[in-house]
Interface confidence: medium
Amino acid sequence: ECVTQLLKDTCFEGGDITTVFTPSAKYCQVVCTYHPRCLLFTFTAESPSEDPTRWFTCVLKDSVTETLPRVNRTAAISGYSFKQCSHQISACNKDIYVDLDMKGINYNSSVAKSAQECQERCTDDVHCHFFTYATRQFPSLEHRNICLLKHTQTGTPTRITKLDKVVSGFSLKSCALSNLACIRDIFPNTVFADSNIDSVMAPDAFVCGRICTHHPGCLFFTFFSQEWPKESQRNLCLLKTSESGLPSTRIKKSKALSGFSLQSCRHSIPVFCHSSFYHDTDFLGEELDIVAAKSHEACQKLCTNAVRCQFFTYTPAQASCNEGKGKCYLKLSSNGSPTKILHGRGGISGYTLRLCKMDNECTTKIKPRIVGGTASVRGEWPWQVTLHTTSPTQRHLCGGSIIGNQWILTAAHCFYGVESPKILRVYSGILNQSEIKEDTSFFGVQEIIIHDQYKMAESGYDIALLKLETTVNYTDSQRPICLPSKGDRNVIYTDCWVTGWGYRKLRDKIQNTLQKAKIPLVTNEECQKRYRGHKITHKMICAGYREGGKDACKGDSGGPLSCKHNEVWHLVGITSWGEGCAQRERPGVYTNVVEYVDWILEKTQAV
């Protein structure tokens, strides 16, 4: 059962796992949600009736029954983890805490003009978890405007005290706002030296990498595969750090793999969602329950529905025993990972999918695409929307992409002559334009935000946001696409598609069925050669075949250039302009979305 509200002057008795310090009850609830075992918590607010050493304590709790006895206590605020809820969860915390000093290891001290600059510095520093900034009103002259970057083993403060004229806050890495470079490659036959901060068991290097990404102190990792010569170290995932944030040495070793935390581009990768099954693999851990199940998929469902289950092992039925049902062992551990991994015993293992909602919704796998053909099928491009104008009569105006539950990203040039958002309608989950009738539900547009440097499509800044009047409930047919990460400049996209209801040739009409075309990206240098009369800037990206034949066209404007990388779709471009349609040696020109991530986040995350 999902309980979101906080219980004032209430304390949960017993069930303590650990105590951390958080600046608010709201953040305590987030910490509890991200902790592998926490189901409930009690937070102590500052209060004259409470011992100041207990202020800001956040006690994380667990219970077999998923609840604990309640006791009245002034200044105590209790609640439940969001693990029991089905809604999206984010670790992003932009709050600034006034007159609070969050204690940790002060490893960097510098002068900053404002708390915002200090927070940006923390976000762009690989080690920084949170910061404290002494304002210009701070009593001690030599400490005024000092920005202290801090880290701890847990990522949360070791203590929080009241201190006048300072402000504190957290790194915004989990808000996708970091400039730190993302190295996505996993390096085979490589061991990274440097100090281990923790070790866990993992079935493969990908799970090891995801564990590293959400571990507060992990910057890179080394994973020993099941073929590693030393038996005791097989399936061991070593979480590592170094002063520079990078490995000091790479050692060539067979059967080991190494890689990096993807903390600064975690909004566009699955971090908590380990959806694979591991065949002939047994996960060991504390047993929660043993239930009969028809298949390993059914076993995973049982684990996902049991709030305390973290992973499972399924042993298929022997011949005709038990109506063909096998045994499903639901398990847990202190850190959410198996305590040991064994191979060759015939089990099928995997993880709960309950934590998938802690990843960005845009990382969810969508149904496999239909290869060949140009017409799309339902649910193939669930982020694609059709934007209609109702003036003078209703018609398709442009494409667009869902990037958040209240936000559509599209092209600025679509709004030439549009006087008011009132005449706009956004339809999502649509395959055929003919589905749109008088009574078809749509989203009204509350606000059109056009980039303030936009003049015309050909000169760039062809980007706009639509804020919807109501929120989109995500389903298989309408869900967001991930934005590319700022730190992700090394990704080379090879699987890119342009979609829309636009013309199929220059003189044509809007298509009924959503069309798709696979199109290769073209370097800006090559693109510039094809458009001598224009300036192809780094804020544009081009795509097209040299011989032409496939391209976006009139009516596709504002729609997505979607590229798949590591099973996740990214909104790489927005259909903007081109010379004719699908002409030989005339690639389509798209708005290069990665160059506008800051602008998008600034507009969509404005308080």
Epitope: R121, D124, V126, L246, G487
Partner: nanobody, 122 residues
């Protein structure tokens, strides 16, 4: 203390090549990363390429991928930027920077050279 001195800038025609060098001296082994940044007239600082000093990881910004190559000669304590197929929009003052973070943010670099001007024009 670390000192960085760039050289190799100059005037070059579109399509031409240049090789920038950055000689580092002082306490350089404390630096986790080195980078080339550039500042075009009237624009802000833009990251061009990064290199991790010990492990050699490299990253390029989109607009220079396939044209520029960053490298480092540890024995000479020198960082290089080989620039091919130069375009007018590459015109800028190029700065070499050293710091402890592998980052695109200029604020992550504590040490900077004085800059070398690259002009691409016919």
């Amino acid at each position: 203390q670390v000192q960085l001195v760039e050289s190799g800038g100059g005037l070059v025609q579109p399509g031409g090549s240049l090789r920038l060098s950055c000689a580092a001296s002082g306490y350089t082994y404390s630096m986790g990363a080195m980078a080339w940044f550039r500042q075009a007239p009237g624009k802000g600082l833009e990251g061009v390429s990064l290199i991790a000093t010990s492990s050699g990881f490299i990253s390029y910004t989109d607009s220079v991928k396939g044209r520029f190559t960053i490298s480092r000669d540890n024995s000479k304590n020198t960082l290089y930027l080989q620039m091919n197929s130069l375009r007018a929009e590459d015109t800028a003052v190029y700065y070499c920077a050293a710091g402890t973070q592998f980052s695109w943010s200029p604020g992550s670099y504590n040490y900077w050279g004085q800059g070398t001007l690259v002009t691409v024009s016919s």
